[in-house]
Amino acid sequence: GSMAHSDGIFKKEQAMCLEKIQRANELMGFNDSSPGCPGMWDNITCWKPAHVGEMVLVSCPELFRIFNPDQDMGVVSRNCTEDGWSEPFPHYFDACGFDEYESET
């Protein structure tokens, strides 16, 4: 079913995200003590590492495309602040139609 399909997509996206973050950390010279915001997988989509003051934009994840193949992709942003990542804006639920990954189990 679509849930099983989405389960596979999310596991794949998560694995790809962790690889992307590792590569980005190497390229940007980021480590655990670096100022800024570390890359993260927030259980919905991937956020690349960012410097303080930077705003990062991401498209709604692939699951959105399954449910809405003919629609424009929504966009969500986070700001990297001195206190870390801001909350996503707009909220995933409003921009993408869902706000957390649900598995069948």
Partner: antibody, heavy 123, light 107 residues
Framework: QVQLQQSGPGLVKPSQTLSLTCAIS??????????WNWIRQSPSRGLEWLGR?????????HYAVSVKSRITINPDTSKSQFSLQLNSVTPEDTAVYYC?????????????WGQGTLVTVSS | DIQMTQSPSSLSASVGDRITITCRAS??????LNWYQQKPGKAPKLLIY???ILQSGIPSRFSGSGSGTDFTLTINSLQPEDFATYFC?????????FGPGTKVDIK
């Protein structure tokens, strides 16, 4: 065919609790695709979205900040209905109250509405 | 809150006319905008969602366009049943605010 049928008193005294129910037919309050919303309309405030409940493996609620401290929206899965409770009402809460189903296709929209209930807050 | 404004607030038109109603958001809402029609004593009825997509069962004389802050609802060849009040609604930031409405009446 989705239908929403509202029920509840049309007159509430100031400081008391406004309670309305919306019975769903043709869909389920536990649907993983829908949200279940309350909206009100008055001449002074126009159409005002109040809040919603929805099920995605667990129940969630979103409320408008303007009423967040006073509002509760509860699903009743046994009767496939949902309710609105608005506490500490004042005459400013006098309005026509609507329930509506929210659906997603590129954005959230309200595609089926209840018939509306005029609620007057007066002593 | 995002403020939604509509213009005109009312308009008089004749059957067969083409009319345009404008909705403006106080900040960008991309294409997260809905249009509703309401007749006296009735609940609002969904016409268009996501800025431009016609709801199932709505006649093709209704169309929506726009993105960002400026949106339009167009009714081609106005029919007697189209005399009503029209509302826009932004659907991206809680609270999901509505415009004040545009009343379309018979000239």
């Amino acid at each position: 065919q989705v239908q929403l049928q509202q029920s509840g008193p049309g007159l509430v005294k100031p400081s008391q609790t406004l309670s309305l129910t919306c019975a769903i037919s043709g869909d389920s309050v536990s649907s993983r695709q829908a949200t279940w919303n309350w909206i009100r309309q008055s001449p002074s405030r126009g159409l005002e979205w109040l809040g919603r409940t929805y099920y995605r493996g667990k129940w969630k609620n979103h409320y408008a900040v303007s009423v967040k401290s006073r509002i509760t929206i509860n699903p009743d899965t046994s009767k496939s209905q949902f309710s609105l409770q608005l506490n500490s009402v004042t005459p400013e809460d006098t309005a026509v109250y609507y329930c509506a189903r929210g659906m997603w296709q590129g954005n959230w929209f309200l595609d089926h509405w209840g018939q509306g209930t005029l609620v007057t807050v007066s002593s | 809150d995002i403020q939604m404004t509509q213009s005109p607030s009312s308009l008089s038109a004749s059957v067969g006319d083409r009319i345009t109603i404008t909705c403006r958001a106080s900040q960008s809402i991309s294409r997260y905008l809905n249009w509703y029609q309401q007749k006296p004593g009735k609940a609002p009825k969904l016409l268009i969602y996501a800025g431009r997509i016609l709801q199932s069962g709505i006649p093709s004389r209704f169309s929506g366009s726009g993105s960002g802050t400026d949106f339009t609802l167009t009714i081609n060849s106005l029919q007697p049943e189209d005399f009503a009040t029209y509302f826009c609604q932004q659907a991206i930031i809680n609270p999901y605010t509505f415009g004040p409405g545009t009343k379309v009446d018979i000239k």
